[in-house]
C-alpha cells in the first residue's frame, strides 16, 4: 500500500532544494501542477505552478522557485534556490483538477533551513539567473486562487531500517528520514 510520507531536508542559507514529485503519467501528464507550503493551522498556499496545460520539460520560474514538468516521465521537478531561513516549512506538490479538489502528490517535504555558510564549495548560490541560466518565464494561466481545505495531518513514523546512501555534504543526526542534499554551482 502507498504510504503518505514526509521527508526532511536540512539545508543552509544560500543552498538549493532540488526535489521531485511523481504522478500517474496517463492521468496527469498535461494537468497543471503546483508547489505549496503548508503552515501550521493554515490552508496550503500555492507558491508556484506550471502552465495550463503543463508544458513538457519547460522551466517555469517564480521568484526563487523553478518548476519543470517531465510529462514523458511523470515527474515534476522543484528547485528552490538561494534558500532563506524563512523558507523553512512543510511543502507539497499538487495537481489541479478543477472543479475537484487538488490531488496531492508524494512525498511531502519538510524543509529546515539554518543560518550559516555550509563550507561546501559552490553552496553560496545567490543569483538564480546565474546559477540556472533559465530565461525567466511567466505562467500564461495564473495559479488557481483556491487552496485545498484538506486538513494537515502528521505523517506516520517510518521504518528506521534504512541504510545510508552516498549523500555526505550535510551532517546527519540519527534521525533516519533527514535527507542530506548536495549543493551545486
Amino acid at each position: 500500500a502507498t504510504k503518505l510520507t514526509e521527508e526532511k531536508y536540512e539545508l543552509k542559507e544560500g543552498q538549493t532544494l532540488d526535489v521531485k514529485c511523481d504522478y500517474t503519467l496517463e492521468k496527469f501528464a498535461s494537468s497543471q501542477k503546483a508547489w505549496q507550503i503548508i503552515r501550521d493551522g493554515e490552508m496550503p498556499k500555492t507558491l508556484a505552478c506550471t502552465e495550463r496545460p503543463s508544458k513538457n520539460s519547460h522551466p517555469v520560474q517564480v521568484g526563487r522557485i523553478i518548476l519543470e514538468d517531465y510529462h514523458d516521465h511523470g515527474l515534476l521537478r522543484v528547485r528552490m534556490v538561494n534558500l532563506q531561513v524563512e523558507d523553512s516549512g512543510l511543502y507539497q506538490c499538487v495537481i489541479y483538477q478543477p472543479p475537484k479538489e487538488p490531488h496531492m502528490l508524494f512525498d511531502r517535504i519538510r524543509l529546515v533551513v539554518t543560518k550559516g555558510f555550509s563550507g561546501t564549495p559552490g553552496s553560496n548560490e545567490n543569483s538564480t539567473q546565474n546559477v540556472y541560466k533559465i530565461p525567466p518565464t511567466t505562467t500564461k494561466a495564473l495559479c488557481p486562487l483556491y487552496t485545498s481545505p484538506r486538513t494537515v495531518t502528521q505523517a506516520p513514523p517510518k521504518s528506521t531500517a534504512d541504510v545510508s546512501t552516498p549523500d555526505s555534504e550535510i551532517n546527519l543526526t540519527n534521525v533516519t528520514d533527514i535527507i542530506r542534499v548536495p549543493v551545486f554551482n
Epitope: 504510504k3 526535489v19 504522478y23 517535504i109
Partner: antibody, heavy 122, light 107 residues
Framework: QVQLVQSGAEVKKPGASVKVSCKAS????????INWVRQATGQGLEWMGW????????GSVQKFRGRVTMTRDTSIHIAYMELSSLRSEDTAVYYC???????????????WGRGTLVTVSS | DIQMTQSPSSLSASVGDRVTITCQAS??????LNWYQQKPGKAPKLLIY???NLETGVPSRFSGSGSGTDFTLTISSLQPEDFATYYC?????????FGQGTRLEIK
C-alpha cells in the same frame, strides 16, 4: 545484507514479452527509486526508466514507451520490468539499480543487481 | 537529450601510473555527474557522485572534478584491480544518459 537479486537468464522469440524481477533486501524498499539499465554485449549502459516503489508510478525513455511496464509488489519487496514486442536488438543484460530517495533529484545508482541476460532469437 | 562524450575510448597504462579520463557534456550540467566502474561480467559500481564525492568504500586514489560541461576522473596510482571500463552519467535533466565508456587496459 543490502542487495538486489535478479531473476535468471531468459531466451525469447521475436514478438514475445519478458518479465525480469528484482528483489530488494536490507533496506526500506519503498524509500528509494528502482531504475532499469540495459547493456547489449560489448556496448555501453542505457537507462530505460525508473519506478517509485511507494507510489507505483514509473516513467521510461521515449524509445521504450509503450513497450516497457514497471511494476512492484511491496509486500515481497520485488520490482518487475516487462518488455514486450521483443526484437533481436533487445538482446542485452538488464540491470535493476537503486536510485536516490524517492523525493530527491539524486539520480545516482549505488546498488545494482547482477543483471539478467535476455536473448531474443528465432 | 544531453550527450556525454568520454575520452579516450580506450587507454593502456601500467600499475602505478596516474590516469585521467575525461567526460564532456553537450550542455551545462553543473555538478550533476556520476562515475561508475564496470568489470567484465559484473554490474557497474558507483565510484564518484555529484562530480567530486567519493562513494563510501571506494579507495581514495579515485577522485573526480569538474563542473558545467567538463569533468575528470583521476586514478592517482593504478592498481591491478583498477583495469576495467569507466562510465560517466549525468542527471541534470531527463533522460539520464551515460558516456560511451573508457576501457582501461594493462600496458
Amino acid at each position: 545484507q543490502v542487495q538486489l537479486v535478479q531473476s535468471g537468464a531468459e531466451v525469447k522469440k521475436p514478438g514475445a514479452s519478458v518479465k525480469v524481477s528484482c528483489k530488494a533486501s536490507g533496506y526500506t524498499f519503498t524509500r528509494y527509486d528502482i531504475n532499469w539499465v540495459r547493456q547489449a554485449t560489448g556496448q555501453g549502459l542505457e537507462w530505460m526508466g525508473w519506478m517509485n516503489p511507494n507510489s507505483g508510478n514509473s516513467g521510461s525513455v521515449q524509445k521504450f514507451r509503450g513497450r516497457v511496464t514497471m511494476t512492484r509488489d511491496t509486500s515481497i519487496h520485488i520490482a518487475y520490468m516487462e518488455l514486450s514486442s521483443l526484437r533481436s536488438e533487445d538482446t542485452a543484460v538488464y540491470y535493476c539499480a537503486r536510485g536516490g530517495y524517492t523525493s530527491s533529484w539524486r539520480w545516482y545508482f549505488d546498488l545494482w543487481g547482477r543483471g539478467t541476460l535476455v536473448t531474443v532469437s528465432s | 537529450d544531453i550527450q556525454m562524450t568520454q575520452s579516450p575510448s580506450s587507454l593502456s597504462a601500467s600499475v602505478g601510473d596516474r590516469v585521467t579520463i575525461t567526460c564532456q557534456a553537450s550542455q551545462d550540467i553543473r555538478k550533476h555527474l556520476n562515475w561508475y566502474q564496470q568489470k567484465p561480467g559484473k554490474a557497474p559500481k558507483l565510484l564518484i557522485y555529484d562530480a567530486a564525492n567519493l562513494e563510501t568504500g571506494v579507495p581514495s586514489r579515485f577522485s573526480g572534478s569538474g563542473s558545467g560541461t567538463d569533468f575528470t576522473l583521476t586514478i592517482s596510482s593504478l592498481q591491478p584491480e583498477d583495469f576495467a571500463t569507466y562510465y560517466c552519467q549525468h542527471y541534470a535533466n531527463l533522460p539520464i544518459t551515460f558516456g560511451q565508456g573508457t576501457r582501461l587496459e594493462i600496458k
